[in-house]
Amino acid sequence: FERTRSLQDPCSNCPAGTFCDNNRNQICSPCPPNSFSSAGGQRTCDICRQCKGVFRTRKECSSTSNAECDCTPGFHCLGAGCSMCEQDCKQGQELTKKGCKDCCFGTFNDQKRGICRPWTNCSLDGKSVLVNGTKERDVVCGPSPADLSPGASSVTPPAPAREPGHSPQ
């Protein structure tokens, strides 16, 4: 079958990193500089992505794979394949239309991206506040006041919340 296919379409023999050059009797020609083909049998090579401005090169383009970009310090990736860069803020801030703004009292953000979220209301679960919240951290809830007695062990604070969508998978 492969032989038949090759007789019908000489281009199927062209490997990744080359293209089937119609101007040269369908000879497999290497991709020109700054271009690539990631699969065989291609009639053109794709232009390499260029990581400019706020983007920086994470992986150089090769004849068989596109360049990969990430963001310069102070920015983070958005979108598939880091198609966009968004400004970082400090912990305890969120990004608004006017730039980075401090979290309002009663809210926190423990990441450089995302939004300020209200502190957990411990009393809704019948618990007390063990550690007060800050702009950078949620409150830590402890046992209910009735449960507190001399010698009662303290509650281990949970790990900090991770920012939605940007945490390790």
Epitope: L78, M84, E86, E94, T96, K97, K98, C104, T107, R113, G114, I115, C116, R117, P118, T120, D138, P158, A161, R162, E163, P164, G165, S167, P168, Q169
Partner: antibody, heavy 116, light 108 residues
């Protein structure tokens, strides 16, 4: 591939209970803020519930005390337990990952019909 | 908690440009996100942040913002763009979510 697959809807009588499931792939539910959003027939979108990555939960006033959001980290799945269902809870329910100022992805939706 | 206001219905001739708007106090501080919903399907994110398109969303979709108004523009509308479009913004309380009432777009 990042996606959410829902199950668990159906026809239920007023006062009854139902549990919706939302299985995630391509990301970890427990590391994210997750929401349930619903859409009554012919109406717009309304948020129902939110769970923080730390486990803190929030509810819209219309479902407070009746609905419970939870997750099973080992199954990478989000749940919505719905009790004391009312006719006005009839809607398509969607789960979604809350990215702060946008939601993505969304589950495919599951219809809950509360009727006698 | 604030509200977001959208025109209930908008129509556009095939291949022409249409703008769908969303008004609300929260939009003075925060960008809107926009969702496309076709009958019987889940909402799909089409624009988020200042003017960001998720992978797979055609570049004929764009977003802009001025004052308390956010706009979704479709340049060269196609038949497959016929759908309901919802805007969304966070409230000043980061846990409360507000959606616009939706705009039904008809492509003539």
């Amino acid at each position: 591939q990042v996606q959410l697959v829902q199950s668990g809807g159906g026809l239920i009588q007023p006062g009854g209970s139902l549990r919706l499931s939302c299985a995630a792939s391509g990301f970890t539910v427990s590391n994210n803020y997750m929401r349930w959003v619903r859409q009554a027939p012919g109406k717009g979108l309304e948020w129902v519930s939110l769970i923080y990555s730390t486990g803190t939960t929030y509810y819209a006033d219309s479902v407070k005390g009746r609905f419970t959001i939870s997750r099973d980290n080992s199954k990478n799945t989000l749940y919505l337990q719905m009790n004391s269902l009312r006719a006005e809870d009839t809607a398509v329910y969607y789960c979604a990952r809350d990215r702060g100022q946008w939601f993505d992805p969304w589950g495919q939706g599951t219809l809950v019909t509360v009727s006698s | 908690s604030s509200e977001l206001t959208q025109d209930p219905a908008v129509s556009v001739a095939l291949g022409q440009t249409v703008r769908i708007t969303c008004q609300g106090d929260s939009l003075r501080s925060y960008y809107a996100s926009w969702y496309q919903q076709k009958p019987g399907q889940a909402p799909v994110l089409v624009i988020y942040g200042k003017n960001n398109r998720p992978s797979g969303i055609p570049d004929r979709f764009s977003g802009s913002s001025s004052g308390n108004t956010a706009s979704l523009t479709i340049t060269g509308a196609q038949a497959e763009d016929e759908a309901d479009y919802y805007c969304h913004s966070r409230d000043s309380n980061g846990n409360h979510v507000i959606f616009g009432g939706g705009t039904k777009l008809t492509v003539l």
